[in-house]
């Protein structure tokens, strides 16, 4: 029979044959052969693999560094990574939660919808069409684009959610 060029789901092609992938929580020790199945081994303590895989090394669980204000929200398993969160009163700077701040700033392209208080974090919102924010800020709302018309100018460069419009002089047609 012809050697396969593609394999079923949860299989991979090697040496012209389809081998089973290792299940989540296990790593590859040796590929299958004509006579043997794929050999897999469970990940060690503090390691994980979260997909069907042919990895020869498991990934290390994330470390929630207390020096960065982090603590474990959910302990990792052989199939899942550890999830970190911030100490009470602090807030993650990103979804990955790699560091903590007292309250977040809104990135360029976003404005502050609600300023942080002693108990709640900053609430950001995307700048809608016609508005922009070019700075990271804990207080600033999105600013409206400059109205070139009111200055008797024309738009030379369109605005974005991160930049204001650029106005320029009107082209005067000579008689």
């Amino acid at each position: 029979p012809e050697p396969p060029t593609a394999c079923r789901e949860k299989q991979y092609l090697i040496n012209s044959q389809c081998c089973s992938l290792c299940q989540p929580g296990q790593k590859l020790v040796s590929d299958c052969t004509e006579f043997t199945e794929t050999e897999c081994l469970p990940c060690g303590e503090s390691e994980f693999l979260d997909t069907w895989n042919r990895e020869t090394h498991c990934h290390q669980h994330k470390y929630c560094d207390p020096n960065l204000g982090l603590r474990v929200q959910q302990k990792g398993t052989s199939e899942t990574d550890t999830i970190c969160t911030c100490e009470e009163g602090w807030h993650c700077t990103s979804e990955a939660c790699e560091s903590c701040v007292l309250h977040r700033s809104c990135s360029p392209g976003f404005g502050v919808k609600q300023i942080a208080t002693g108990v709640s974090d900053t609430i950001c919102e995307p700048c809608p069409v016609g508005f922009f924010s070019n700075v990271s800020s804990a207080f600033e709302k999105c600013h409206p684009w400059t109205s070139c018309e009111t200055k008797d100018l024309v738009v030379q460069q369109a605005g974005t959610n991160k930049t204001d419009v650029v106005c320029g002089p009107q082209d005067r047609l000579r008689a």
Epitope: S99, C100, L102, S105, F139
Partner: nanobody, 116 residues
């Protein structure tokens, strides 16, 4: 390297006043929103006040509103906190910082003790 050094703390009687200063270096001061926070003995960090880049907008925790005033001098790279009508519960180490205030960098604080 970012450096933020708070000074001006001390022992003051209830009802008294103090003016804290924060000398900033290692970054472009006028491009940063700034913040004062404090930590009372045995307590967590508490936000006190923040100020916009230009100094035109200021924000205060309810506990200090009407008594404290934040300001800045961008030409001197310095942040200030004028504290009036001080109370025993204002006793804390005060830290200045950039927004957003990071857990892993607090700079050098100054101790304010309000006691008779």
């Amino acid at each position: 390297e970012v450096q933020l050094l708070a000074s001006g703390g001390g022992l003051v009687q209830p009802g008294g006043s103090l003016r804290l200063s924060c000398a900033a270096s290692g970054f472009t001061f006028e491009e940063e929103e700034m913040i004062w926070v404090r930590q009372a003995p045995g307590k967590g960090l508490e936000w006190v006040s923040s100020i916009s880049r230009s100094g035109g907008s200021t924000y205060y925790a309810d506990s200090v509103k009407g008594r404290f005033t934040i300001s800045r001098d961008n030409s001197k790279n310095t942040l200030y906190l004028q504290m009036n009508s001080l109370r025993a519960e204002d006793t804390a180490v005060y830290y200045c910082g950039k927004e957003p205030f990071r857990y892993d960098y607090w700079g050098q604080g100054t101790l304010v003790t309000v006691s008779s």
